[in-house]
Amino acid sequence: DSSKWVFEHPETLYAWEGACVWIPCTYRALDGDLESFILFHNPEYNKNTSKFDGTRLYESTKDGKVPSEQKRVQFLGDKNKNCTLSIHPVHLNDSGQLGLRMESKTEKWMERIHLNVSERPFPPHIQLPPEIQESQEVTLTCLLNFSCYGYPIQLQWLLEGVPMRQAAVTSTSLTIKSVFTRSELKFSPQWSHHGKIVTCQLQDADGKFLSNDTVQLNVKHTPKLEIKVTPSDAIVREGDSVTMTCEVSSSNPEYTTVSWLKDGTSLKKQNTFTLNLREVTKDQSGKYCCQVSNDVGPGRSEEVFLQVQYAPEPSTVQILHSPAVEGSQVEFLCMSLANPLPTNYTWYHNGKEMQGRTEEKVHIPKILPWHAGTYSCVAENILGTGQRGPGAELDVQYPPKKVTTVIQNPMPIREGDTVTLSCNYNSSNPSVTRYEWKPHGAWEEPSLGVLKIQNVGWDNTTIACAACNSWCSWASPVALNVQYAPRDVRVRKIKPLSEIHSGNSVSLQCDFSSSHPKEVQFFWEKNGRLLGKESQLNFDSISPEDAGSYSCWVNNSIGQTASKAWTLEVLYAPRRLRVSMSPGDQVMEGKSATLTCESDANPPVSHYTWFDWNNQSLPYHSQKLRLEPVKVQHSGAYWCQGTNSVGKGRSPLSTLTVYYSPETIGRR
């Protein structure tokens, strides 16, 4: 049953004289193992004998014997799966049909394989992509329908006969599906590769040439251009002529259009390979190139920078920066279109030439107010001198200058006056917009820069003002010099340091804290009576009668000021003691008699002592001695003694007469 035999192998194998063939092969015999195998060359079936006739290249039998001449052909298979064969070397006359005659116990099969052996190594085949574009990576493939384990080969790539630098990847296939050797080369062709010959060379293991295939590269690319200009340096003067020519070195496919560009913009009606510029103007300076297009895209030449030279144009001045702050640095830049660039500059300030300034830039490291004004310049190159442009204005800003505080009042100023001050300045940029005053007070500003102080205080010593724009400038403080009557007049005891005792030497000082003007007069007064005109009031020996309320007055040309009343207290021992009797010095017995010890003392008497006519002290110590009821025996002379912290004083004797009552007389 033939359906039981299934074979897989390449349909045809290719080789050349002296090489080898390796025939990958698999089979399946479903009824058991292979018992006999014969490899025929060009087998033909003989109907008479019911057998195949042909050259037997290989034969294996049950006993496994193989004739010795069969070493060239090897059966590398087995009894149930593998039918791989090798012929080494292979000869030209091996070409034709190989027949694998397989026999199992019950079945037979003839499998045919084509073998194509050439006289010389056949060439590989180069495969190219359908289109190749410059700079786009492509894969070149070199394919050879040959591979054999016993005959190593290599494929090498050449460009115009020179080995290519790019690394190729070689792969081989020896499978039942296909037998080949393949080399793949990744390559980014440039436009210059167009028309060049690429070769894939088949070599043996020693690098000996066997065969090759060649292709001509057709690299699609945009037109490649060259540009030429007359004059060659592309530097001309206004009115000269310029010619530019564009040459196409290569284009694939054919170019279709040509145009010229200036600074990237297409020039109208310029569609030939020559650009003629007659009587050029400075506006025609710029970067020129030609552009030629084909189906791949536009190609551009290198740029030619055409310089049309001309004398400087009227100049303008750029100021970095205006307005400028006084003290800052400022740079002036003279800007003038010219070709070639100006080599010399003349600078003007307010129309007057600035000496020694010949550069494009003028740098002023420290700007002052007088630097303000109009700056202009003139540029000069080899073709001539430009005109002076309108110039630029430098505005120098600074704080207000020479600020002064001015008192508007007639002098002198007296305490309580209304004072008007003004804040003046010499110059300011920008204008003064506000004023400040020191010290701050609840004062009126009736108009800008004027200060009114109502009821000026004696202690308003100095005032300063500031005029402000973007900055504030302070004036030196001005002294108001307010005149006022003496202040804080008071009486001060200089001596004695302790309390005043009668008989002491006493000095009182009339003090004041301040006075303006300084020239003063003093007045001392006691109970409305003028005592002296010096600053001190002196008592050589003070007496109790000097005690009392004292005031001093200090006056200057503005006015006079009195001190608070000051009480002068004189301490003295009790004096002028006398004993007074109530109801009188004659009292009837049985009645009541009160003796009072009267005295003058400072401080008051703190302790009294009573004495009788015998100078006997009585056991009474209060100011009053009360005798009740009075007896005749009480009659006699009494005196008292008063004591205070200063000393003692005694009274003269005072006689008390106690007479008998009518009752006593009646009893007698």
Partner: nanobody, 125 residues
């Protein structure tokens, strides 16, 4: 379609001169690289001379260098070949052709897309 018509050929004695003209129809002639080729009986076509559109690039074959001069007038869409010191070997049909592939391919006939019919030049001894 570009059409080219040659004129100026004829019979001339060796050492003599001829001036060939090639007129193109349409403006595209002015942007084409123009070449002259010749073909003698029984011989392959041979490159003679080529001129770029601007006239800035000119190429001659070694066999005519110093004797022939190629020029062009783009305003007239015309290319000229001034042939001096003619030799018997110069006998051939002279054909003008237009190329839009650039001067690197000026001597490669296969890169010329448009061809004239040719004009016969015969140099006698």
């Amino acid at each position: 379609q570009l059409q080219l018509v040659e004129s100026g050929g004829g019979l001339v004695q060796a050492g003599g001169s001829l001036r060939l003209s090639c007129v193109g129809s349409g403006d595209r002639v002015s942007i084409a690289l123009m070449g002259w080729f010749r073909q003698a009986p029984g011989k392959e076509r041979e490159f003679v001379a080529a001129i770029s559109p601007s006239g800035g690039r000119i190429t001659y074959s070694d066999s005519v260098k110093g004797r022939f001069t190629i020029s062009r007038d783009n305003a007239k869409n015309t290319v000229y070949l001034q042939m001096n010191s003619l030799k018997r070997d110069d006998t051939a049909v002279y054909v003008c052709a237009a190329n839009f592939r650039g001067y690197l391919s000026s001597s490669r006939g296969s890169d010329y897309a448009y061809w004239g019919q040719g004009t016969q030049v015969t140099v006698s001894s």
